[in-house]
């Protein structure tokens, strides 16, 4: 239930996060599961624990194994497992499947390739990017923050992309590389000003107090893969994440491609345990892309339960 796979290359830095959640103030203890030996916290060690993070600086093939992390809350010890595998560096250019992160796909209008796991590291821009082991050069390639943007993507751009960056720990530098495949979807598409299919403008949605309710924001943006298209919900003009109501969450639906070929997106707003005060809020379905933003407003009203008379 709380286990996670992590991998890296020998002589590179590898940082692994404990799969169990805990507050930053909680103590986290790490152990090497096979020997039950405690991982030290002193940074002078090559392998050391730092709160929720386990750091291999640098990693060695012998470090492979299962590591146990125990998050010590005041009430319970919450246990997680990190299955770590460190591989020898390949002499040739090929990156084996077991070192690959998830494949991403792009098109002419959307060609972002994110560098996997980089958020765990203390790195500074710019990233170096390689395709099939060749350093990327030319104005078509732009390293931006933690991702690579390719302009005017062509089918020939498909391949394995490796990001390389330096992790800094107390003044010492360690190299990190991560590779993922990029596939190109060959689509002749176009984009339009967003069209919201649901909800209707100023729609009144009936809900029952105490029950769960779902609102779906659905919009279409044109044909083919869209660059910079999004649907989202706002509450009283505020982003859901900023509104601070744990009962109300948004959840991405499926990318939809209707029979007419239009590219559409869904965003479902889930309201758990509907309360009276939810009826006072204004719910805005927003659809935006490079052409602009369209907004449809929904309000909730109380559904009166049907009386059953004998």
């Amino acid at each position: 239930k709380f286990s996670k796979q992590s991998w890296g290359l020998e002589n590179e830095a590898l940082i692994v996060r404990c799969p169990r959640q805990g507050k930053p103030s909680y103590t986290v203890d790490w152990y090497y599961s096979q020997t039950n030996k405690s991982i030290p916290t002193q940074e002078r060690n090559r392998v050391f624990a730092s709160g929720q993070l386990l750091k291999f600086l640098p990693a060695a093939v012998a470090d492979s194994g299962i590591y146990t992390c125990i998050v010590r809350s005041p009430t319970f010890n919450r246990t997680g497992y990190a299955n770590v595998t460190i591989y020898k560096k390949q002499s040739d250019c090929n990156v084996p499947d077991y070192l690959m992160y998830s494949t991403v796909s792009g098109s002419e209008k959307n060609s972002k390739i994110y560098c996997p796991t980089i958020d765990l590291y203390n790195w500074t821009a710019p990233l170096e990017w390689f395709k099939n082991c060749q350093a990327l050069q030319g104005s078509r390639y732009r390293a931006h923050k933690s991702f690579l943007v390719i302009d005017n993507v062509m089918t020939e751009d498909a391949g394995d992309y490796t990001c390389k960056f330096i992790h800094n720990e107390n003044g010492a530098n360690y190299s990190v590389t991560a590779t993922r495949s990029f596939t190109v979807k060959d689509e002749q598409g176009f984009s339009l000003f967003p069209v919201i299919g649901a909800p209707a403008q100023n729609e009144i949605k009936e809900v029952e107090i105490g029950k769960n309710a779902n609102l779906t924001c659905s919009a279409c943006f044109g044909k083919g893969t869209q660059f910079l298209a999004a649907v989202l919900w706002q509450l009283n003009g505020t982003k859901i994440t900023d509104f601070g109501e744990p009962r109300i969450q948004q959840e991405e639906g499926q990318n939809q491609s209707f029979s007419n070929g239009l590219a559409c997106l869904d965003m479902v707003l889930r309201i758990a345990d509907v309360k009276e005060e939810d009826l006072l809020l204004q719910y805005d379905c927003l659809a935006l892309n490079l052409h602009g933003l369209r907004r449809h407003t929904v309000r909730l009203s109380r559904k009166n339960p049907i009386d059953h008379h004998s």
């Epitope: 507050k23 930053p24 005041p74 319970f76």
Partner: antibody, heavy 119, light 106 residues
Framework: QVQLQQSGAELVRPGASVTLSCKAS????????MHWVKQTPVLGLEWIGA????????AYNQKFKGKATLTADKSSSTAYMELSSLASEDSAVYYC????????????WGQDTTLTVSS | DIVLTQSPPILSASPGEKVTMTCRAS?????MHWYQQKPGSSPKPWIY???NLASGVPARFSGSGSGTSYSLTISRVEAEDAATYYC?????????FGAGTKLELK
């Protein structure tokens, strides 16, 4: 929606034992810790202890060790607290409470069980 | 055990007034939670992790603090705010509550 249904009021004799129950619904019982709290006019709110229904692990306030025993039945999504060797100072309102697993605070409280210990 | 001392024990305020109640811990805690209880009802989560409002809590409430000193503030008191407010720490076992501040409206 999340509900914690506690058993009804109890009137018991000193020296006896009693088991209070708390039936959970509206969420996955094993995903959240269940805690118990005692409330009296004199001492206010006191944390008794907690159980992790997934593992059966328990944590107690030292003050209530030997007094309270916490258990959970996964099949019925019910948490139990047994109170033993009852005395008048055990007379109180008792709450079972679910804990928010992200922020570690008491997010859903049962409606309470009133326990009266009297001869 | 970490002892939480709430002050004042009773707070009397007029509607529209700004009020602040405090909770002092006998040793440093990382976060403070607050609960509201009205007579005959179970306590309700009110503020968690020092400053986050729980579900359905009006925006006139706010929480702040760090270390050993925490507070709950109501910018403009309303009649429905009359209740007892308890602070609670989750930094060490046993978890402990304050004795409460009872907010009365004039």
């Amino acid at each position: 929606q999340v509900q914690l249904q506690q058993s009804g009021a109890e009137l018991v004799r000193p020296g006896a034992s009693v088991t209070l129950s708390c039936k959970a619904s509206g969420y996955t019982f094993t995903d959240y810790e269940m805690h118990w709290v005692k409330q009296t006019p004199v001492l206010g709110l006191e944390w008794i202890g907690a159980i992790d229904p997934e593992t059966g692990d328990t944590a107690y306030n030292q003050k209530f060790k030997g007094k309270a025993t916490l258990t959970a039945d996964k099949s019925s999504s019910t948490a139990y607290m047994e109170l033993s060797s009852l005395a008048s100072e055990d007379s109180a309102v008792y709450y079972c409470i679910r804990v928010d697993s992200n922020y570690d605070y008491f997010d859903y409280w049962g409606q309470d069980t009133t326990l009266t210990v009297s001869s | 055990d970490i002892v939480l001392t709430q002050s004042p024990p009773i707070l009397s305020a007029s509607p529209g007034e700004k009020v602040t109640m405090t909770c002092r811990a006998s040793s440093s805690v990382s976060y403070m939670h607050w609960y509201q209880q009205k007579p005959g009802s179970s306590p309700k989560p009110w503020i968690y992790d020092t400053s986050n409002l729980a579900s359905g809590v009006p925006a006139r409430f706010s929480g702040s603090g760090s270390g050993t000193s925490y507070s709950l503030t109501i910018s403009r008191v309303e009649a429905e705010d009359a209740a007892t407010y308890y602070c609670q720490q989750w930094s060490s076992n046993p978890l402990t509550f304050g004795a409460g501040t009872k907010l009365e409206l004039k």
